[in-house]
């Protein structure tokens, strides 16, 4: 899951393997920092849990498209951008 290596950088070292239903997601943010081993998406669930996901996965792309289109995603201060 998300792991703060040194404030304010948040990186994803592992990504979720199983698909999460879009109805369980309420927002996302992009991780692109060069201090992180990989680019990633962090989803926030309706239960306020943060989950790392692989942005290349089709379900992840579909989920962020859905969140953008339905404006469910609110602007989260990106904790790490490249």
């Amino acid at each position: 899951g998300p792991d703060a290596v040194s404030t304010p950088v948040t990186c994803c070292y592992n990504v979720v393997k199983q698909k999460i239903h879009v109805r369980k997601l309420k927002s996302y943010r992009r991780i692109t920092s060069s201090q992180c081993p990989r680019e990633a998406v962090i989803f926030r669930t309706i239960l306020d849990k943060e989950i790392c996901a692989d942005p290349k996965e089709k379900w992840v792309k579909n989920s962020i498209n859905h969140l953008d289109k339905t404006s469910q995603t609110f602007i989260l201060e990106p904790s790490c951008l490249g």
Partner: antibody, heavy 117, light 107 residues
Framework: EVQLQQSGAELVKAGASVKLSCPAS????????MHWVKQRPEQGLEWIGR????????KFDPKFQGKATITADTSSNTAYLQLSSLTSEDTAVYYC??????????WGQGTTLTVSS | DIQMTQSSSSFSVSLGDRVTITCKAT??????LAWYQQKPGSAPRLLIS???SLETGVPSRFSGSGSGKDYTLSITSLQTEDVATYYC?????????FGGGTKLEIK
């Protein structure tokens, strides 16, 4: 630190082909998408296409289909752009860039391609 | 394809000015907009992604706003080092497309 190294310049004859390289350091190209962007002299930026180095899947702007081929070698962590049947219209700076989300946060310094007749 | 239009190709500005550069898409791009700065002889530099998110290391005088089809890059107090060409780019759908660029020149 992420770095995308590109050779400075290439001079090639019209009708020939050229293969431009973009070796990456500070990242594993398998984890991202590698893109190529064209900029003609005194003009704007045009996205050519991208590759997913993990599986070789490519996506192009239709206007570059047939002109451009994008490949990647994960063992050398390098992306390539091949341009065929070169004309003066291909004279430009070609940039490689990384970005899994469709925007480009790290860029190479660009290779200037000059097509001579 | 989604077309991106930057209304002005060049701007004559004074140091210390507030500068606003606009960008319009031919369809809704759902905030999937990036802004780049390019100086002569250099590669573009990403300033903003997701319409509003400032990249690390970019001065806070830069900001992005907008939604739907219409987006804006603002520079609150123009500095010498901000004289450059600025491009918007949509990343809602491939082929990803750039605006034509807006060049800032000192009066």
């Amino acid at each position: 630190e992420v770095q995308l190294q590109q050779s400075g310049a290439e001079l090639v004859k019209a009708g020939a082909s050229v293969k431009l390289s973009c070796p990456a350091s500070g990242l594993n190209i398998k984890d991202t998408y590698m893109h190529w962007v064209k900029q003609r002299p005194e003009q704007g930026l045009e996205w050519i296409g991208r590759i997913d180095p993990a599986n070789g899947n490519t996506k192009f702007d239709p206007k570059f289909q047939g002109k451009a081929t994008i490949t990647a070698d994960t063992s050398s962590n390098t992306a390539y752009l091949q341009l065929s049947s070169l004309t003066s219209e291909d004279t430009a700076v070609y940039y490689c860039a990384r970005g899994v989300f469709g925007f480009f946060d790290y860029w190479g310094q660009g290779t200037t391609l000059t097509v001579s007749s | 394809d989604i077309q991106m239009t930057q209304s002005s190709s060049s701007f004559s500005v004074s140091l210390g000015d507030r500068v606003t550069i606009t960008c319009k898409a031919t369809e809704d791009i759902y905030n999937r907009l990036a802004w780049y700065q390019q100086k002569p002889g250099s590669a573009p530099r990403l300033l903003i992604s997701g319409a509003t998110s400032l990249e690390t290391g970019v001065p806070s005088r830069f900001s992005g706003s907008g939604s739907g089809k219409d987006y804006t890059l603002s520079i609150t107090s123009l500095q010498t080092e901000d004289v450059a060409t600025y491009y918007c780019q949509q990343f809602w759908s491939a082929p990803y497309t750039f605006g034509g660029g807006t060049k800032l020149e000192i009066k």
